[in-house]
């Protein structure tokens, strides 16, 4: 059981992917802090030459959904929906392999950006993965 809140997305950095859908936040005023963090991360990514087009096409929406997870509307308590593990692994191991290696070895990026750990996500086909967020 989670101890958080479901509230409409109020930011702009991820509005293209999230719109004004309801997102899960651990505290009522956390959205502003996360919005600032993701803007800082996007600023670093945008000015870096380490991001390929094929990676950014999927990494940006994926980071948005990770930072601002949709609320699970099938749950009776506020609960975030996970990213889909298979897509997370494709992103990390295929589409953005070079970028992930660079990011994980760069303290400046790690300070500003929480990267999803695919191993923490439920296995495909498991009941917990049934409602995962597909990019």
């Amino acid at each position: 059981e989670e101890d958080g809140f479901c509230q409409p997305y109020r930011g702009i950095a991820c509005a293209r992917f999230i719109g004004n859908r309801t997102v899960y936040m651990e505290s009522l005023h956390m959205q502003g802090e996360i919005e600032n963090q993701i803007t800082a991360a996007f600023t670093m990514i945008g000015t870096s030459s380490h991001l390929s087009d094929k990676c950014s096409q999927f990494a940006i929406p994926s980071l948005c959904h990770y930072a601002f997870p949709y609320c699970d509307e099938t749950s009776s308590v506020p609960k975030p929906r996970d990213l889909c593990r298979d897509e997370c692994e494709i992103l990390e191991n295929v589409l953005c392999q070079t970028e992930y290696i660079f990011a994980r070895s760069n303290p400046m990026i790690l300070m500003r950006l929480k990267l999803p750990n695919c191993e923490d996500l439920p296995q495909p086909e498991s009941p917990e993965a049934a409602n995962c967020i597909r990019i």
């Epitope: 109020r10 950095a13 509005a15 005023h29 502003g32 600032n36 600023t43 940006i60």
Partner: antibody, heavy 119, light 107 residues
Framework: EVQLVESGGGLVQPGGSLRLSCAAS????????IHWVRQAPGKGLEWVAA????????IYADSVKGRFTISADTSKNTAYLQMNSLRAEDTAVYYC????????????WGQGTLVTVSS | DIQMTQSPSSLSASVGDRVTITCRAS??????VAWYQQKPGKAPKLLIY???SLYSGVPSRFSGSRSGTDFTLTISSLQPEDFATYYC?????????FGQGTKVEIK
């Protein structure tokens, strides 16, 4: 030096269209939120729309939703406001401004461009 | 939409006076409030962001504070160049809304 320069204002008939431009220089354009804010003659400030060029995300005021479209060309460091189905109440000075995040203030503003909707 | 109710709409003051302008949000906006100064025919200028942070280059006589949904802009000692219109703005929710403005005039 950070600069925002608006252009494209003028006189247009009700129901007509106009495209405003906001040319940015002196900063990493795609990393900032660009806003359009308007001010009717003798009135207060009204926020109109915003775009985050890096993710092409946009948000609008209800009063312009469906009529106005905000866009950005990162290769030209320019934001645009396409205004269709213009009404007399859209008459205002239109400013573009930037903010590093929507949760922070608009720290640089352009000089404004006047849009007059009248027959 | 979140309403930002600014008061007073105008005030007369003398150089050296302490001036206080208030903005009340119709619901919680956290600390996502900025204050701007605008002079006739000019673009607004940012004074305060995040309710109480002084923007770079703004004189220290300007300050901002928050108490719940009430936000205050204070000018500790009014200077001749401070006669202008002041606006608050919330950026917590869409649409981003401004207060109606407070015109500070010379007494």
């Amino acid at each position: 030096e950070v600069q925002l320069v608006e252009s494209g204002g003028g006189l247009v008939q009700p129901g007509g269209s106009l495209r405003l431009s906001c040319a940015a220089s002196g900063f990493t354009f795609q990393s900032y939120v660009i806003h359009w804010v308007r001010q009717a003659p003798g009135k207060g400030l009204e926020w109109v729309a915003a775009i985050y060029p890096y993710s092409s995300s946009t948000i609008y005021a209800d009063s312009v939703k469906g009529r106005f479209t905000i866009s950005a060309d990162t290769s030209k460091n320019t934001a645009y406001l396409q205004m269709n189905s213009l009404r007399a109440e859209d008459t205002a000075v239109y400013y573009c401004a930037r903010s590093w995040s929507v949760y922070l203030g608009m720290d640089y503003w352009g000089q404004g461009t006047l849009v007059t909707v009248s027959s | 939409d979140i309403q930002m109710t600014q008061s007073p709409s105008s005030l007369s003051a003398s150089v050296g006076d302490r001036v206080t302008i208030t903005c009340r949000a119709s619901q919680s906006v956290s600390s996502a409030v900025a204050w701007y100064q605008q002079k006739p025919g000019k673009a607004p200028k940012l004074l305060i962001y995040s309710a109480s942070s002084l923007y770079s280059g703004v004189p220290s006589r300007f300050s901002g504070s928050r108490s719940g949904t009430d936000f205050t802009l204070t000018i500790s000692s009014l200077q001749p160049e401070d006669f202008a219109t002041y606006y608050c703005q919330q950026s917590y929710d869409s649409p981003r809304t401004f207060g109606q403005g407070t015109k500070v005039e010379i007494k």
